[in-house]
């Protein structure tokens, strides 16, 4: 007999982790004698229903180092149905684990800190009902380095007053380096905290005043977060208590003794001005978050940044004036002193003109590589200014209102009227997600490029070369989600001689000219997905001959354009390696006699082709035969294929990955995978497969991954695979209605390859007989039972 998975109903994962998450357990499982509990160092019991912990629950896990009990008995306000739940923990429950280093009790209805072993290093008590920490709460935890106790008194987990940390309660924790007490209604920073603290997070409390005595003796602090204590509620995505005063009150010497401070968060504090004395002596400050304040005026004349020569990241986002967008904005000259600045976030300050005076003091900063200018209502942008920046690698101008090259005459700062404002009566401070997953993935390839600009989600209708003057250094450009309705003809991007990646998805581009994009000699990746409008104009033809002339192009997306008729009959390119043609009408095109039979054949070096969502109802052998022979990956996912001629895979001698998920295959019949195929991965999940012909997989000797999940299989048979079953690294059979008869052969097979079967312990379930439906195939040992025990359906 094969051995049952040792930690049923849980799953053994790498590095000594037993995963018992989401199993509806009401008690801590007792593992079988065969389970080698001494090797288990991590146990995760997240999101179960364990409401009572006993002294004996963990005695068999003597070497446990990490225990996660999060979300078992959530407090009323955090419970999805607002059930009240009180977790009981017997006094010696955790003391049995003498090696325990990490314990997470978050999201449980506990009111006191249980007794804990002295070995503990990391403790999380967040989103519980613990409202008091005194000297006894954590007595003896001399190894404790990290304590999280967030969210024990706030709108989602309300309490009558506030969390109370008595003075000196944590003083005995001489190794404590991280303390987080966010969302606890604290009105003061607890006094007499251990001087070992390096990270102190007390954001989103009610601490509206901060002075040096609040942080006395905390000379080791490296990160201090006091944000959200005096909020500007007009920018709050959640219930917000208006601050009882006009801003957070900071004593001029609050931080003077914190010479090791590297990160300071003062976000959402209703600050209107910056006092340079706050930052005096912060010689190591490298990250400063001043977002969501009222610093729109202050940043134009402050000298507070004068001495922050080590600052690497500065966040000034959403420092807008309520209901106003400014005509223009000029940063203060003290910005030029930020000689170590690498990243500046100026999203959501709301100004309409971006010209050479806006950011003039940033241009010479030797390390500034990232600049965020999203959501500013910019409608006039002189993009050429970025050509003079010394180190710039990424400028994000997405979600603005740029409609073309800047046409305004250049007002000097002296002439500029900074008070000129425009009322914003319905500015949405919470814009939609910034990019669709597809375009995000496309732009990910720009991470290591020298210079990227994001102009997505603006109001561009036409592209003019003047927009890009002085930007020849640009290697990656996103123009997605605009309204560009142009017939591109090779003159639009002339200055961009080094451009390698261009994202034009979600526009209305008219592709007709053979010279389209020919002005971009270095272009390697081009995204033209979601430009369907021109293709849906009945009677208008489109031409893809431009692809031939892009000699460096490797990646092309024409996805989701509803391309189905009146386009070039061939795509030709020696360079293209990846073509995304998903979301089009190849089904219709291949039905037009032989017109589009050779559509992809001219892509002589193509390695990956995505034909998912192409309304394919039938795939003829000649369709596969006329795909490039170089092809290694073919995706036919989410079509309507009910039949597949498996022997025709021999037409694709280099194919390694075939994705047929989400089709309508009823069976894996019609021959077998052909001899000599190099196929390594086959995904036929989410079909309607009822049966598989014997030896179907047997000849595919390179096969490593097979996904048969979400089908209608009643068994998994060794005969389908032959000896290659032992070569598999993944055999996914989840979500099939397996017939759990006594002596069911699939049990032995799956046990034999159990390390290769995802979710074997719990995700592989019975579909019949009735009493086992929906239960794990190990709910009963099918190898040892008698047939009459299980009634047949």
């Amino acid at each position: 007999l094969g051995t049952l998975p040792a930690f049923l109903p849980c799953e053994l994962k790498p590095h000594g982790l037993v995963d018992c998450n989401w199993l509806f357990l009401k008690s801590v499982p007792r593992f079988s004698a065969a389970a080698s509990c001494s090797n288990i160092t991590r146990l995760s019991l997240i999101s179960n229903r364990i409401h009572h912990l006993h002294n004996s629950d963990f005695v068999h896990l003597s070497n446990l180092r990490q225990l996660n009990l999060k979300w078992n008995c959530p407090p009323t306000g955090l419970s999805p149905l607002h059930f009240s739940c009180h977790m009981t923990i017997e006094p010696r429950t955790f003391l049995a684990m003498r090696t325990l280093e990490e314990l997470n009790l978050s999201y449980n209805g506990i009111t006191t800190v249980p007794r804990l072993p002295s070995s503990l290093v990391n403790l999380s008590l967040s989103h519980t009902n613990i409202l008091v920490l005194d000297a006894n709460s954590l007595a003896g935890l001399y190894s404790l380095r990290v304590l999280f106790m967030d969210g024990n008194c706030y709108y989602k987990n309300p309490c009558t007053g506030a969390v109370k940390v008595t003075p000196g309660a944590l003083l005995g924790l001489s190794n404590l380096t991280h303390l987080s007490l966010k969302y606890n209604n604290l009105t003061k920073v607890p006094r007499q905290l251990p001087p070992s603290l390096e990270y102190l997070l007390v954001s989103y409390n009610l601490i509206v005043k901060l002075g040096p005595e609040d942080l006395a003796n905390l000379t080791s602090l490296r990160v201090l977060d006091v944000g959200g204590n005096c909020r500007r509620c007009d920018h709050a995505p959640n219930p917000c208590i208006e601050c009882g005063q006009k801003s957070l009150h900071l004593h001029p010497e609050t931080f003077h003794h914190l010479s090791h401070l590297e990160g300071l968060v003062l976000k959402d504090s209703s600050l209107h001005t910056l006092n340079s004395s706050w930052f005096q002596g912060l010689v190591n400050l490298s990250v400063l978050d001043l977002s969501e304040n009222f610093l729109y005026e202050s940043i134009t004349h402050t000298n507070a940044f004068q001495n922050l020569t080590r600052l690497r990241k500065l966040n000034l986002s959403f420092n807008y004036r309520k209901k106003v967008s400014f005509a223009r904005l000029h940063l203060a000259s003290s910005f030029k002193n930020l000689v170590s600045l690498q990243e500046l976030n100026m999203n959501g300050i709301f100004f309409r003109l971006l010209n050479k005076y806006t950011l003039r003091w940033l241009a010479d900063l030797p390390k500034l590589h990232t600049l965020h200018l999203q959501m500013n209502f910019i409608n006039q942008a002189q993009l050429s200014i970025f050509g003079t920046f010394r180190a710039l690698r990424f400028v994000d101008l997405s979600d603005n209102r740029i409609s073309g090259p800047s046409t305004l005459s250049e007002a000097t700062p002296e002439e500029a009227d900074d008070a000129e404002q425009e009322e914003l009566l319905s500015a949405d401070p919470h814009p939609a997600p910034l990019s669709t997953p597809a375009s995000k993935n496309f732009m990910d390839r720009c991470k290591n490029f020298k210079f990227t600009m994001d102009l997505s989600r603006n109001n561009l209708v036409t592209i003019k070369p003047e927009m890009f003057v002085n930007l020849s250094r640009l290697q990656c450009l996103s123009l997605s989600h605009n309204s560009i309705a142009q017939a591109v003809n090779g003159s639009q991007f002339l200055p961009l001689t080094n451009l390698q990646v261009l994202d034009l998805s979600h526009n209305k581009l008219d592709l007709y000219h053979w010279k389209s994009f020919s002005e971009l000699p270095q272009l390697q990746a081009l995204d033209l997905s979601y430009n369907s409008q021109p293709f849906s104009m009945k009677g208008i033809g489109h031409n893809f001959s431009f692809v031939t002339h892009l000699s460096m192009l490797q990646s092309l997306s024409l996805a989701h354009n509803d391309i189905h008729t009146r386009v070039s009959s061939h795509l030709n390119s020696n360079s293209v390696r990846f073509l995304d043609f998903s979301g089009n009408g190849m089904g219709r095109m291949w039905d037009e006699g032989g017109l589009y039979l050779h559509f992809f054949q001219g892509l002589s070096g193509l390695l990956k082709l995505d034909l998912s969502q192409n309304n394919l109802h039938i795939l003829r052998p000649q369709n596969l035969d006329n795909l490039p022979k170089s092809l290694k990956l073919l995706s036919l996912r989410d079509n309507y294929l009910s039949f597949f001629n498996w022997t025709s895979l021999s037409f694709l001698p280099n194919l390694e990955v075939l994705d047929l998920a989400g089709n309508q295959l009823k069976a894996l019949t019609n021959g077998t995978l052909p001899n000599g195929t190099l196929l390594q991965k086959l995904d036929v999940s989410s079909n309607s497969i009822v049966s598989v012909v014997p030896a179907f997989f047997a000849l595919a000797v390179e096969l490593k991954e097979v996904n048969l999940s979400h089908n209608i299989l009643k068994t998994v048979d060794r005969s389908w695979f032959g000896p290659i079953v032992m070569n598999l690294t993944v055999l996914d059979v989840r979500s099939n209605p397996l017939h759990c008869a006594c002596g069911a052969a699939f049990v032995d097979l799956l046990l034999e390859v159990q390390t290769k079967v995802p979710g074997l312990a719990n995700g592989v379930k019975c579909g019949s007989p009735g009493q086992l439906q929906g239960r794990s195939i190990f709910a009963q040992d099918l190898r040892l039972c008698l047939d009459e025990v299980l009634s047949w359906d």
Epitope: T166, K188, R191, G211, E213, Q245, K246, S247, H249, H251
Partner: antibody, heavy 116, light 106 residues
Framework: QVHLQQSGPDLVKPGASVQMSCKTS????????LHWVRQRPGQGLEWIGW????????KYNDQFRGRTTLTADKSSSTAYMFLSSLTSEDSAIYFC?????????WGQGTTLTVSS | DIQMTQSPSSLSASLGGKVTITCKAS??????IAWYQHKPGKGPRLLIH???TLQPGIPSRFSGSGSGRDYSLSISNLEPEDIATYYC????????FGGGTKLEIK
């Protein structure tokens, strides 16, 4: 040395209003709270309220809210307390005091007499 | 609102002697208490803050102690200039003075 200089004594009629001042020196006026405290004859000290000159925020003791207004003039580093609808009950010595947490410096006091 | 009950309201002691004044808060004030000395015609003078921290320039004859709700001010080795009224002040939540203790020398 921090100094808080209060205006001189005042005699006013019931129903009238009064404004007293507290001129500060030798510290940054906008960085600290300025409080007002009352001492009636033969009685103890009562906190009236504070103003934070840095942003003009104010906080009042409930007993004094409505008839009391605290203001500050940054240019002269002077704080003011305005009391209206005076009655004989308002006869007292009024102190101003500087604080961050606790009151560390006090003015000498202004004596207000409300009498017809 | 936090109430501060100070006692005694007056006391008489001998030069060179020691006196203790107490203040009881209506709730835990986490050591946020200050003590003042007040002489007629002047503004009060800060002696102690955060329950036990002596203000610079104040003689060490003055000391403060306590925690939670109960706090005290002690003056040892009494001198003539110690004749004054003494007040406690809680600054944990807004501000409340105790009723005062008038110290006289026998």
């Amino acid at each position: 040395q921090v100094h808080l200089q209060q205006s001189g004594p005042d005699l006013v009629k019931p129903g009238a209003s009064v404004q007293m001042s507290c001129k500060t020196s030798d510290y940054t006026f906008t960085n600290y709270y300025l409080h007002w405290v009352r001492q009636r004859p033969g009685q103890g000290l009562e906190w009236i309220g504070w103003i934070y000159p840095g942003d003009g925020s104010t906080k009042y003791n409930d007993q004094f809210r409505g008839r009391t207004t605290l203001t500050a003039d940054k240019s002269s580093s002077t704080a003011y307390m305005f009391l209206s609808s005076l009655t004989s009950e308002d006869s007292a010595i009024y102190f101003c005091a500087k604080s961050w947490d606790y009151f560390d410096y006090w003015g000498q006091g202004t004596t207000l007499t409300v009498s017809s | 609102d936090i109430q501060m009950t100070q006692s005694p309201s007056s006391l008489s002691a001998s030069l060179g002697g020691k006196v203790t004044i107490t203040c009881k808060a209506s709730q835990d004030i986490d050591n946020y208490i200050a003590w003042y000395q007040h002489k007629p015609g002047k503004g009060p003078r800060l002696l102690i803050h955060y329950a036990s921290t002596l203000q610079p320039g104040i003689p060490s004859r003055f000391s403060g102690s306590g925690s939670g709700r109960d706090y005290s001010l002690s003056i040892s080795n009494l001198e003539p200039e110690d004749i004054a009224t003494y007040y406690c002040l809680q600054y944990d939540d807004l501000y409340t003075f105790g009723g005062g203790t008038k110290l006289e020398i026998k």
